[in-house]
């Protein structure tokens, strides 16, 4: 997929920043707000920000600029620069009247069909598990294969470097075609097929990608919030995977929740399957030692481990992936439209 250009975005923060630079008042306010960063630590939901008056004034001046409401895209060039601007401006939106974070990512809906050639899969045993089949589909695609090998190398060996591994994982889930990435990670396994379950759980190379000792979940979030990319991905996930009702209907749609979930892989908040025998997922962290923030910690942890929207989105995608291989398609090469969510 070609990377989205700035012009394809409704209101890119990079464009908005350039516009702002051309206006002396806006430019001065932006620079001032940027320098406020050190004096305003990013507040966590349990904290109230204390804001110097001059920062509030700069924020007020920015509220009328095109920077307010600017957005970024997950696959855009200069994404980190765009997100840096977004979070600087976000302070202007929320100062003095602390709002919950809003996802910086603009939704661009693509309904491009995914072309697959299943005929090449006949080199596999007919009873091979679906995780093996989806891995093979990735191998048969040059781009997917190249990106997978890159993270495979970075994440293997007894002395792997975790930060390098995470960067390559992030690159894979950002640049590989979405159906390939989703097929690889969200492949369905028979309930008793532990080998398949293990293959699925090892997709993201957890031995290297995940911390050897589980940190406290709130510490992990604090670390994540200090990085614009990780913060953006977490906020995007919490925006799109919020259950709207007790049935687990996602706040937006299942496909959007899954995209946000996959977007976390390679960040400090990398989730994974917890076992070989089911499809439960969790963060690699603990709420032990959270003191009076125990409830808040459990809420963060539960957003992954006990989220009916996410659970149902994963289950629906796995059902879809099962159907891909259970139908007699008219031709060995066929196009599969992006799966529409069931909700």
């Amino acid at each position: 997929d070609p990377l989205p250009t700035e012009s394809r975005l409704m209101n890119s923060c990079l464009q908005a920043r350039r516009k702002c630079q051309a206006d002396p008042t806006c430019s001065a306010a932006y620079h001032h707000l940027d320098s406020c960063t050190s004096s305003i630590s990013t507040p966590l939901p349990s904290e109230e920000p204390s804001v110097p008056a001059d920062c509030l004034e700069a924020a007020q001046q920015l509220r009328n600029s095109s920077l307010i409401g600017c957005m970024c895209h997950r696959r855009m060039k200069n994404q980190v620069a765009c997100l840096d601007i977004y979070w600087t401006v976000h302070r202007a939106r929320s100062l003095g009247n602390y709002e919950l974070d809003v996802s910086p990512y603009e939704d661009t809906v693509t309904s491009k069909p995914w072309k697959m050639n299943l005929s090449k899969l006949n080199m596999l045993k007919p009873d091979s598990d679906l995780c093996l089949k989806f891995a093979m589909l990735c191998t048969l695609n040059d781009k997917c294969d190249r990106l997978r090998k890159a993270y495979g190398e970075a994440c293997s060996g007894p002395h792997c470097q975790r930060h390098v591994c995470l960067r390559q994982l992030l690159t894979f889930f950002e640049k590989a075609a979405e159906p390939h990435a989703q097929g690889l990670l969200l492949c369905p396994c028979a309930p008793n097929d532990r080998g398949c379950g293990e293959r699925r759980r090892n997709t993201i190379a957890p031995n290297c990608a995940l911390p050897p000792v589980a940190p406290n979940c709130l510490e992990l979030r604090r670390l994540c919030f200090s990085d614009p990319l990780c913060r953006s991905r977490l906020v995007d996930f919490q925006t799109h995977c919020h259950p709207m009702d007790i049935l687990g209907t996602c706040a937006t749609e299942q496909s959007r929740c899954l995209r946000a979930y996959l977007g976390l892989i390679g960040t400090a908040m990398t989730p994974n399957f917890v076992s070989n025998v089911n499809t439960s997922v969790a963060l690699s962290c603990t709420c032990r030692g959270s003191g009076n923030l125990q409830e808040e910690c459990e809420m963060l942890e539960g957003f992954f481990s006990h989220n009916p929207c996410l659970t149902e989105a994963i289950a629906a995608k796995m059902r879809f992936h099962s159907q891909l291989f259970s139908q007699d398609w008219p031709h060995p090469t066929f196009a599969v439209m992006a799966h529409q969510n069931e909700n």
Epitope: P243, D245, I246, L247, G248, S280, E298, P308, T311, A315
Partner: antibody
Framework: EVQLVESGAEVKKSGSSVKVSCKAS????????ISWVRQAPGQGLEWMGG????????NYAQKFQGRVTLTTDESTSTAYMELSSLRSEDTAVYYC????????????????WGQGTLVTVSS | DIQMTQSPSSLSASVGDRVTITCRAS??????LNWYQQKPGKAPKLLIY???SLQSGVPSRFSGSGSGTDFTLTISSLQPEDFATYHC?????????FGQGTRLEIK
Amino acid sequence: EVQLVESGAEVKKSGSSVKVSCKASGGTFSRYAISWVRQAPGQGLEWMGGIIPLFGTLNYAQKFQGRVTLTTDESTSTAYMELSSLRSEDTAVYYCAVFYYGSGSYRNWFDPWGQGTLVTVSS
Amino acid sequence: DIQMTQSPSSLSASVGDRVTITCRASQSISSYLNWYQQKPGKAPKLLIYAASSLQSGVPSRFSGSGSGTDFTLTISSLQPEDFATYHCQQSYSIPITFGQGTRLEIK
């Protein structure tokens, strides 16, 4: 295994309110969806609403919107259902139930249930 | 709202009989259907979830089938403890709705 214990029977005057409690034990309370279902004498089951404390997600059946309030107290693992402007037709047994989710297959069912609280509304 | 209609409303049967209760949804609900058993003065008890999965601890004489709009609860050989009221319930969409119940009595 989660268990639910509801508060005792209530007799209320028409126009007043009733607050029924449902205490959970044996599981992490905030992670479950708690629903309320009522059953008038000799009638079928009627869903009133549900809450997922973890996400602050709340749903009410249209029929009860504005009259019912569902809340939870996580420190005591207790869910509450308050019904206001009571009328004689509200005489029923009120059940709380864990609305199970997270199975990864076709979602959601009620299990387990509380023992029920009989609310009698007299005019 | 999705209407759930059970039939029959009541039926009489003898121990050892095979009994079938049906539940029809006013629109397709895929397999998002559950069955409960309720005895007088007691809370309902889950028997079958997701149309055909047997809840653990429930005897295998109970079975469920169907998808879309038509569902069936079957008791293959009635036992004395099976005489009760049976309810179907959909969890496809909010509001969650129940059938009106089927009362199973001893003939």
